[in-house]
């Protein structure tokens, strides 16, 4: 029987470092090895018939035990599939190796209205583009961490908001007078130093009532 296997199905490596993606196989007399890369909608062939393809040949080398990168970039993050078949036969096996190229978060950008109307919906956003794996976000009001559930802490029990740590979106609905304050957010992805945005003050103002 044929086997295709990797003892490291997930590899995490800082950007600009070398890495080897292992693929061990047995039971093939004339193995034909291919590696493909998948990331979202993108699929690329890294290795075809035991040879690295042109788009990778300057920085990837084929070995009998896997493929080795001289230096990885954040764009290399994705799933690599090692596919082994018998030359001219019907034996086949494959194994997937997930590569996560570690990049620390950059300083997050916030979009916070300087004033918003009490009783209305107010949306605050926080994002950063560099972090790999993607960052999770924590919001602060006047330097105090905002819990995911406002009712869980006395300091925020009068607020009504939904906080999404994955997208970085903070939605007040409805906004109350006590929501006035200075807001900032922090991005962290478990690698490198967490980064904090600038703090921006938001005023919760009364609705203008026409005379």
């Amino acid at each position: 029987s044929v086997t295709v296997h990797s003892s490291e199905p997930e590899v995490r490596i800082p950007e600009n470092n070398p890495v080897k993606l292992s693929c061990a196989y047995s039971g093939f007399s004339s193995p034909r090895v291919e590696w493909k890369f998948d990331q979202g909608d993108t699929t690329r062939l890294v290795c075809y018939n035991n040879k690295i393809t042109a788009s990778y040949e300057d920085r990837v080398t084929f070995l009998p035990t896997g493929i080795t990168f001289k230096s990885v970039t954040r764009e290399d993050t994705g799933t690599y599939t090692c596919m082994v078949s018998e030359e001219g036969g019907n034996s086949y096996g494959e194994v997937k190796v997930k590569l996560i190229v570690l990049v620390p978060p950059s300083k997050p950008t916030v979009n916070i209205p300087s004033s918003a109307t009490i009783g209305n919906r107010a949306v605050l956003t926080c994002s950063e583009q560099d972090g790999s794996p993607p960052s999770e976000y924590t919001w602060f009001k006047d330097g105090i961490v905002m819990p995911t559930n406002p009712k869980s802490t006395r300091a925020f029990s009068n607020s009504s908001y939904v906080l999404n740590p994955t997208t970085g979106e903070l939605v007040f609905d409805p906004l109350s007078a006590s929501d006035t304050g200075e807001y900032s957010c922090e991005a962290r992805n478990g690698y490198g130093t967490p980064m904090t945005s600038n703090a921006v003050r938001m005023e919760a103002v009364e609705r203008n009532v026409g005379v």
Epitope: T3, H5, S6, S7, E8, P9, I13, N17, P18, V19, K20, S22, A24, S26, T61, L63, P64, T65, T68, F69, K70
Partner: antibody, heavy 116, light 106 residues
Framework: EVQLVQSGAEVKKPGASVKVSCKAS????????MHWVQQAPGQGLEWMGY????????RYSEKFQGRVTITADTSTDTAYMELSSLRSEDTAVYYC?????????WGQGTLVTVSS | DIQMTQSPFSLSASVGDRVTITCQAS??????IAWYQQKPAKAPKLFIH???TLESGVPSRFSGSGSGTDYTLTISSLQPEDFATYYC????????FGQGTKVEIK
Amino acid sequence: EVQLVQSGAEVKKPGASVKVSCKASGYSFTDYSMHWVQQAPGQGLEWMGYIDPYNGGTRYSEKFQGRVTITADTSTDTAYMELSSLRSEDTAVYYCARQTDYFDYWGQGTLVTVSS
Amino acid sequence: DIQMTQSPFSLSASVGDRVTITCQASQDINNYIAWYQQKPAKAPKLFIHYTSTLESGVPSRFSGSGSGTDYTLTISSLQPEDFATYYCLQYDNLWTFGQGTKVEIK
């Protein structure tokens, strides 16, 4: 014939560092990752980490991370394992082992004794 | 991390006995287990890989079996040269050894 030949026994003082070598022959050194395994007296085997000699990429066990450095010299087909800030519990035999998927060939072992 | 629980820690047996050593993984390791024999002051020697594939030169009295999380090394008829310590190694996800089983003369 595949052979892994390690350097001789070492005696070190606590706080010092030790560097153990493992010379490979009988195969293409850069094709296979080289691992290091610790065996304390009367104890079992513990995986420490490895190096891909082709590109110098390494991975270390959490237990040894920060104290162990594995390197390789492709001009001499030799792998090295350096352990720093030695303490008495580092007294052990250290083995290099070639990885196919499992470990198929092992060095003869190097005894490192840490004693004041 | 995958943990490997090997048992027994030690066993006493006589020449000709059937000996069984087990390793239990903390999760399914998909048959990616190897067995090593180690004699005093010697390096471990690979005996079996991928659950049941014997290395060349290993006597046929040694066999491996199992699936999922439970694996066994069996020596069908113990010989004098088999007294040693045996270790299992999972290599499905990184590498973890069992604690070892010392096979002693009764």
